[in-house]
Structures are given as C-alpha cells and as structure tokens.
Amino acid sequence: DKVTQSSPDQTVASGSEVVLLCTYDTVYSNPDLFWYRIRPDYSFQFVFYGDNSRSEGADFTQGRFSVKHILTQKAFHLVISPVRTEDSATYYCAF
C-alpha cells in the first residue's frame, strides 16, 4: 500500500485556487482516505475524509475546501478555493 503526493511545495496568491494531488495504491476496494495538515505553529488538524461513497470536511473547510475523489484513478485530490493566508501549512494525504 502506498500514497503518492505529486504536488510540489507551493507559494500561491491569496484568493487563488490550489489543488493538492494525491493518488493511492491499495488492494482494498473502499479505503478510508484522509487529508491532514500541520500548521506553522505545529498544530495538527484533520482536513477531509472520504471513501467511495461520501466525503466530509472539518468545520473550517466549509465553502472553500473540497475533495475530488476520482475512483478510476485512485485519486483523492484536495482543492482549496479561494486560498487564504491562514491555509499555510504542510498537507498530508493518508489512508
């Protein structure tokens, strides 16, 4: 089993859109998928959860964060739009 995040470190303008790419490889047909982030103050936050049939984000994600779960590609991409300065963090995809 493995997760691949192909998006490099990014510096983006506030108000723009960013997509963080994540693909996973597993024998499980319906894995539980997650996005987490570690902020500059080292606080650890849950961002999004998804499986084959649904996705659910933390309260702070409402309206600006979404996931694109492409089942055929085993992809679980995180989209932030519009991005804000408080979104600065290291984002981790996991399952």
Epitope: V19, S29, I70, L71, Q73, A75
Partner: antibody, heavy 119, light 107 residues
C-alpha cells in the same frame, strides 16, 4: 504488440439486445483497466463504460446506465459489453480501449465494431 | 458533467503551415486532458496526455499546452500524414467527455 479486436456488432431492432466482445493480446490483460468508447455517425466520440483491472469497479455515463453492462474474463483476455433496450441513438462504431496504469486517457484502441439500431 | 468545446470545427490548411486547435472545458480540469488523432477509416490514436506530454512515437512537431479550462494542440510544419480529425478528452473524473472534433483538410 498490443492488439484489441472487437466483434459482435450488427443490425438490431430498437428495444433489442446485443453483446460485444473485445479480444486482447500483447499485454497482461488482467493488469489494466478497460473502457468502451463509441463514435456516432456524426463522428462524435462518447465514452460508454469503464471496468477496473480486477473487474471490481464499473462506471457508466447516465446515457447508458442501467442498459449497458461492462464485464471482463481475465482468464480469456476478453472484455464484453452487454447492451439492452437499445435505441436508435446507440447506433455507432464501438471501440474497446485500454487505459494506462491508474490513469484515464485511452492509450490503445481496437479497430471497432459497428452497431446499427434500426427498425 | 464537464463539457468540452473544441474549435475550430474544421480547418483547411497547406502542408508546411502551423495550426493550433483549442479546447475549452466548462470547469477547471487541472491539466487532466488528452488529445487524439483519427485518420479516415481508422480508430483514434493518442497524441498527448496530461495536457503537455507527447505519447510514444508522436513527432516533436506536435505540442500540447494549457491549464485550468483552456488547452491547445499545436502542429508545426504540417505534414501530409497529419491530415485527419483531432479530439480532446478530459479525464478529471467520470463521465469522460470529448470535444466535438476538428477536421484538418488539405487546402
């Protein structure tokens, strides 16, 4: 050399059924996702069905959902498309296509089989 | 569903000329785009994947570019074997949809 050979097309009446086959060779069939794509008489391309490498996941556009069923027999290196409740708008050249690993463009195409739905 | 709008629908050009075909997606597809060439009576063949990557064996006179919702296929110094139809396709999730095609004809 990757080879995909479709068969089973023909003339069928509206409301009828037809089963298409695609014989694959030149690669490890069981390791790749496959799709059926059709081309209408007006030359428009339309994706109609997808099946994962192990056969565990199938996907369809709304236009054929519930009427078409994609399946595969990895032991026979063969892909199938069962079509039922056929309509005149299903008239097209049907191609089977192989995807690359974990991606969704169509890397290899067969030569196609023609399906005509007409009274 | 994501709609793919391709232009022009047809193009009459001479050998040696440079042509650009464009494809517009109804929403951001994040470079999840492929281009195909189809010659008369044949099946389509992959030219470009992930917006900018040339498929194996495709001559370097072909190039893909674009991002967001706007993409293009450029053919430099057209050769006689380049005439035919060209299609774009998004793969930003199912249903995959294609552009209406561009028919490239000899002037």
């Amino acid at each position: 050399e990757v080879k995909l050979v479709e068969s089973g097309g023909g003339l069928v009446q509206p409301g009828g059924s037809l089963k298409l086959s695609c014989a694959a060779s030149g690669f490890t069939f069981s390791s790749y996702a496959m799709s059926w794509v059709r081309q209408t008489p007006e030359k428009r391309l339309e994706w109609v069905a997808y099946i994962r490498d192990g056969g565990g996941g199938t996907y369809y556009p709304d236009t054929v959902e519930g009427r078409f069923t994609i399946s595969r027999d990895n032991a026979k290196n063969t892909l199938y498309l069962q079509m039922s409740s056929l309509k005149s708008e299903d008239t097209a050249m049907y191609y089977c296509a192989r995807h690359p690993p974990m991606n969704d463009w169509f890397l290899y195409w067969g030569q196609g089989t023609l399906v005509t739905v007409s009274a | 569903d994501i709609q793919m709008t391709q232009s022009p629908a047809s193009l009459s050009v001479s050998v040696g000329e440079t042509v650009t075909i464009t494809c517009r997606a109804s929403e951001n597809i994040y470079s999840h785009l492929a281009w195909y060439q189809q010659k008369q009576g044949k099946s389509p063949q992959l030219l470009v994947y992930a917006a900018t990557n040339l498929a194996d064996g495709v001559p370097s006179r072909f190039s893909g570019s674009g991002s967001g919702t706007q993409y293009s296929l450029k053919i430099n110094s057209l050769q006689s074997e380049d005439f035919g139809s060209y299609y774009c396709q998004h793969f930003w999730g199912t249903p995959y949809t294609f552009g209406g095609g561009t028919k490239l004809e000899i002037k």
